[in-house]
Amino acid sequence: IWELKKDVYVVELDWYPDAPGEMVVLTCDTPEEDGITWTLDQSSEVLGSGKTLTIQVKEFGDAGQYTCHKGGEVLSHSLLLLHKKEDGIWSTDILKDQKEPKNKTFLRCEAKNYSGRFTCWWLTTISTDLTFSVKSSRGSSDPQGVTCGAATLSAERVRGDNKEYEYSVECQEDSACPAAEESLPIEVMVDAVHKLKYENYTSSFFIRDIIKPDPPKNLQLKPLKNSRQVEVSWEYPDTWSTPHSYFSLTFCVQVQGKSKREKKDRVFTDKTSATVICRKNASISVRAQDRYYSSSWSEWASVPCS
């Protein structure tokens, strides 16, 4: 048993029928010694008396809020949560496996630049009685500070018969050095509690691996005289690291006809302009990627040819 936060405790249980469970001793937080009784949740049934209560925790029915009283007055509470271990593996029931980039990916994180700021998100089908707490650090043995905000519900989607809820959190490395080579990964830890169940999820990454620039901005077309060609120009996104001479991007320019089946013309360039042929009803799209480290491409920025 361990303390998650004040008056909230997690009991780790092997989740198979013959497992012995955990013997837990609760102590009433009071100087009183006599006349103390214990109850569980809203029940008035007295479970025991005395300053301590010993319980055998085996099932969710043994978890919940234990309260000690004296003469009708509440003295203290202890909330017991369960963390299930099935076949030697901690349960991962609360969050959905996003399966990207690989199976058992519950947390996904992205950074728009090298400033040490990043966003993580996760998915669940649970709509109520759900709380998250996020902690982060760089390295684990001698951790350096990363500050995370509160997790918030950022999107709701319908997936077949189910509703899916996306939560996200923003974190900032306290003493980020954008130009430095990373040697220790960022660790992100999410505590998830659904009713009486506790689970934890972790992700470990280097900022360089989760970089995804914003799309290029100010995408413009300039027709070239007496030609079907146009000059496409754009700018680095505002959120990208500076100076651009050091934090450089490379770009992919794509001409896409109305039909998805039509052949796409693609041009790769390190410049912020390119000359392409603009077909009727086509659109021109540009996306960006770190020039020196192949992390994710940005989303596309697009303009119609007409």
């Epitope: 989740w15 085996k58 029915g61 029931d93």
Partner: nanobody, 125 residues
């Protein structure tokens, strides 16, 4: 979508046996207390038996103790009710119910969140 599907009911002679099954989907099965209830024509629904999430705690109605056994297979998302030494008064529709994070001493049907459609058990004398 949560589904509980009972099977195994039928007609049996007094003293005989039946094994009811209830297959669950759409829930994290091992988090749920699973209960069996029954309702005879013109009577109130009554509690029969319940089993906690990992199967370490069981509860039975006095009328079936020693004759009925509840069990579960969390790998198969299924709960069973083995009924031996059946009596004509066991004739009823048997329902399976689920309660996430519940307690086995929930003998009131109102404490359960999800219900099956029921399977008929008839015991002839």
């Amino acid at each position: 979508e949560v589904q509980l599907v009972e099977s195994g009911g039928g007609l049996v002679q007094a003293g005989g046996s039946l094994r009811l099954s209830c297959a669950a989907s759409g829930i994290i099965f091992s988090d749920n207390v699973m209960g069996w209830f029954r309702q005879a024509p013109g009577k109130e629904r009554e509690f029969v038996a319940a089993i906690a999430g990992r199967g370490s705690r069981l509860d039975y109605a006095d009328s079936v103790k020693g004759r009925f056994t509840i069990s579960r297979d969390n790998a198969k998302n299924t709960v069973y009710l083995q009924m031996n030494s059946l009596k004509p008064e066991d004739t009823a529709t048997y329902y399976c119910a689920a309660k996430p994070y519940g307690r086995v001493f929930y003998t009131e049907g109102s404490n359960y969140d999800f219900w099956g459609q029921g399977t008929q058990v008839t015991v002839s004398s």
